[in-house]
């Protein structure tokens, strides 16, 4: 329960002394304005929208949006006693560039197409920037142009800056082991973090630890090896602080800029330097198959910040922090690249989530346990001799699981020459593959045989 | 750097047993498994099991199981292979070898060697 | 079992030469390993992934192949190159082929 004394809002009439969830109507999954709370502060409630009417009856208005009478100034308790309505205006009024390429008059015309993205299920719309997409901005009033502090760039986007850390399988006892760590930065509210792709490379579990020591099992949306740009996802509740792209297109020689990175938990390490160069060839560094043009700086990057962004003093991000080639010179992915890469994934998750097809063999299975092995050994005298791997319960007929030679009883031991410890494993192998080489221990025979997944519609 | 150094060879009756250590320095020794592989005259190099040092967990190949147990100490970083009920077809040398991993596939395979353990099955 | 094939088992050939090991196997693996073994010492690897070469191995060694096939190249062959060569592959669990040994004419 809220104590009354923990809200900041003046007390509309009847509100109660305590607030009690329990008490809150049940509200509509999507709300078109975004959520915000009631009159009294206790309950989430639909906001209204931009340019809606808002104050008296109708309500408060959504998130990132404040009531406004036709005067300009923000509906108070004294306004609304005078009973006079408002409209719901955005509190940010600058244009913002979209991850789907689109400029937004504001912040809330962005958060609204998001929300209308979401609930055709297609990827949500994220901050790129400020200022419009592709358009140049220079603000003579702007940190980067007045001062010099490092210190202050550092304490507005540590927040942002994540200690990314990956665990291994060990081949036989399945126990997970760390084997690399590197960072990375968030890029939206809802938990996409941006980092290299080698710092994410396949196979891993990855793992996501937030600068208040949050951590979270992290999901690959996207990578482009040859970029070295890798998207991930964390389920988060609530807001995420965001850092936004700057344009590396802009960089001068001779700008200052902050290598920032999460090499441990709870702690960020900072480095700082210059642009040497903003365009140097990946070929001229001796990079395999890179032809990507990189921004050269004497700012340290080394293993503990790579994966970080590199920022500007205005704290937007100018590059991912990539490598080190010799002592002073190091190099980062350059934003614009980053842009590129944000816009192209979201275009190809909206397109893919439009054409996501199912694999399915046609088997019901269950990983098996020891104790189930032995259960079904004490039934089964011919059960195999295995304590781990996938066990078939049944195969359906007309399926690829029976065109491959699966049978009842068969347990999984490994596909593609990767060990089955578990059904899911085994669902994994589905998803990723076009062809399961599969070993399957039959009595206390191991037997090879190979199936095809075949694709359905959800 | 990482080592792995085996006991010294030995010389046992049919029907008896044999116990080869092998120790490990240069790494965390409860991060990576320990296997066996052993090699007969003239023969291939064949996969005996292995042990996750951390917990204990085993894993055995089926044409060793039930004369084969692999243990470890984690406190002396030390793994062991015991052999029972010899016969002469198990003269050959022993070798403990680290599960390696390949970061960039996720592949397994074995990057370090012990020099090897001598056993000589005979009457 | 996944049943190993390697070839041949033995072959002699002269410095300089390029000399080439195949191992096949009776069912897709994902990767092949290569080691090296000189006589009285233990086995050394030198091709991990199918393709990528161990550390300090040098540049004339190399692996290739895919599925059910692999092929290991050396491609100037050099005095000290004499040993036996062993592919493995690791599925549910660890097998080696039977060996290659290599002489020098």
């Known amino acids: 329960q809220l104590s009354r004394a923990g809200r900041s809002a003046p007390l509309a009439a009847g509100c109660p002394d305590r607030c009690e969830p329990a008490r809150c109507p049940p509200q509509p999954e999507h709300c078109e304005g975004g959520r915000a709370r009631d009159a009294c502060g206790c309950c989430e409630v639909c906001g209204a929208p931009e340019g809606a009417a808002c104050g008296l009856q109708e309500g408060p208005c959504g998130e990132g949006l404040q009531c406004v009478v036709p005067f300009g100034v923000p509906a108070s308790a004294t306004v609304r006693r005078r009973a006079q309505a408002g409209l719901c205006v955005c509190a940010s009024s600058e244009p913002v560039c979209g991850s789907d390429a689109n400029t937004y008059a504001n912040l809330c015309q962005l958060r609204a197409a998001s929300r209308r993205s979401e609930r055709l299920h297609r990827p949500p719309v994220i901050v790129l920037q400020r200022g419009a997409c592709g358009q140049g901005q220079e603000d003579p009033n702007s940190l980067r142009h007045k001062y010099n502090f490092i210190a202050d760039v550092v304490e507005k986007i540590a927040p942002a800056v994540v200690h990314i850390e990956l665990f291994r399988k060990l081949p036989f006892s399945k126990r997970e082991v760390p084997v690399a760590s590197g960072s990375g930065f968030i890029v939206s509210e809802d938990g996409l973090i941006v980092t290299n792709a080698h710092v994410v490379t396949n196979k891993h579990r990855v793992k996501v630890e937030l600068k208040n020591g949050a951590t979270y099992e992290a999901k690959i949306k996207d990578v482009d090896e040859k970029a070295d740009i890798a998207l991930i996802k964390i389920d988060h509740q609530g807001k995420l602080p965001v850092l936004l792209l700057g344009r590396s297109s802009e960089l001068r020689p001779g700008e200052f800029v902050v290598a920032i990175g999460s090499p441990f938990s709870l702690q960020n390490t900072v480095t700082t330097g210059i642009v040497s160069t903003t365009q140097r060839g990946g070929k001229e560094l001796g990079l395999r198959n890179s032809d990507m043009d990189y921004i050269q700086t004497d700012a340290i990057i080394n293993y503990g910040n790579s994966g970080g962004p590199l920022v500007n003093l205005d704290g937007e991000v100018i590059g991912i922090n990539t490598l080190k080639v010799t002592a002073g010179i190091s190099f980062a992915i350059p934003s614009d690249k980053i842009k590129k890469f944000l816009t192209e994934s979201h275009d190809r998750q909206a397109k893919g989530k439009a054409i996501t097809k199912k694999k399915y063999i046609g088997i019901r299975m269950m990983s098996l346990t020891s104790s189930k092995a032995k259960e079904l050994k004490d039934r089964h005298r011919d059960f195999p001799d295995v304590i781990s791997g996938a066990y078939i319960i049944e195969v359906i007929p007309d399926t690829p699981a029976e065109a491959g030679g699966l049978k009842e009883n068969d347990v999984i031991i490994s596909i593609n020459g990767q060990s089955v410890v578990s059904a899911n494993d085994v669902s994994d192998v589905i998803k990723r593959e076009s062809t399961l080489n599969m070993v399957v221990r039959r009595g206390n025979e191991d037997i090879m045989i190979t199936v095809i997944p075949e694709e359905i519609d959800p | 750097q990482v080592q792995l150094v085996q006991s010294g060879a030995e010389v046992k009756k049919p029907g008896a047993s044999v116990k080869v250590s092998c120790k490990a320095s240069g790494y965390t020794f409860t991060d990576y498994e320990m296997h066996w592989v052993r090699q007969a005259p003239g023969q291939r190099l064949e996969w005996m099991g292995a042990?996750?040092?951390?917990?204990?967990?085993?894993a055995y190949n089926q044409k060793f199981k039930g004369r084969v147990t692999i243990t470890a100490d984690k406190s002396a970083s030390t793994a062991y292979m015991e052999l029972s009920s010899l016969r002469s077809e198990d003269t050959a040398v022993y070798y403990c070898?680290?599960?390696?991993?390949?970061?960039?596939?996720?592949?397994?395979?074995?990057?370090?060697w012990g020099q090897g353990t001598l056993v000589t099955v005979s009457s | 079992d996944i049943q190993m094939t390697q070839s041949p088992s033995s072959l002699s050939a002269s410095v300089g030469d390029r000399v080439t090991i195949t191992c096949s196997v009776s069912?897709?693996?994902?990767?092949m390993y290569w080691y090296q073994q000189k006589p009285g010492k233990a086995p050394k690897l030198l091709i991990y992934?199918?393709?990528n070469l161990a550390s300090g191995v040098p540049s004339r060694f190399s692996g290739s192949g895919s599925g059910t096939d692999f092929t290991f190249t050396i491609s100037s062959l050099q005095p000290e190159d004499i040993a036996t060569y062993y592919c493995?592959?690791?599925?549910?669990?660890?097998?080696f082929g039977q060996g290659t040994k290599l002489e020098i004419k």
């Open positions: 069912s897709s693996v994902s990767y």
């Open positions: 493995q592959q690791w599925a549910s669990y660890p097998t």
């Open positions: 070898t680290r599960e390696g991993y390949s970061y960039e596939g996720g592949g397994y395979y074995f990057d370090y």
């Open positions: 992934d199918t393709s």
């Open positions: 042990i996750d040092p951390e917990t204990g967990g085993t």
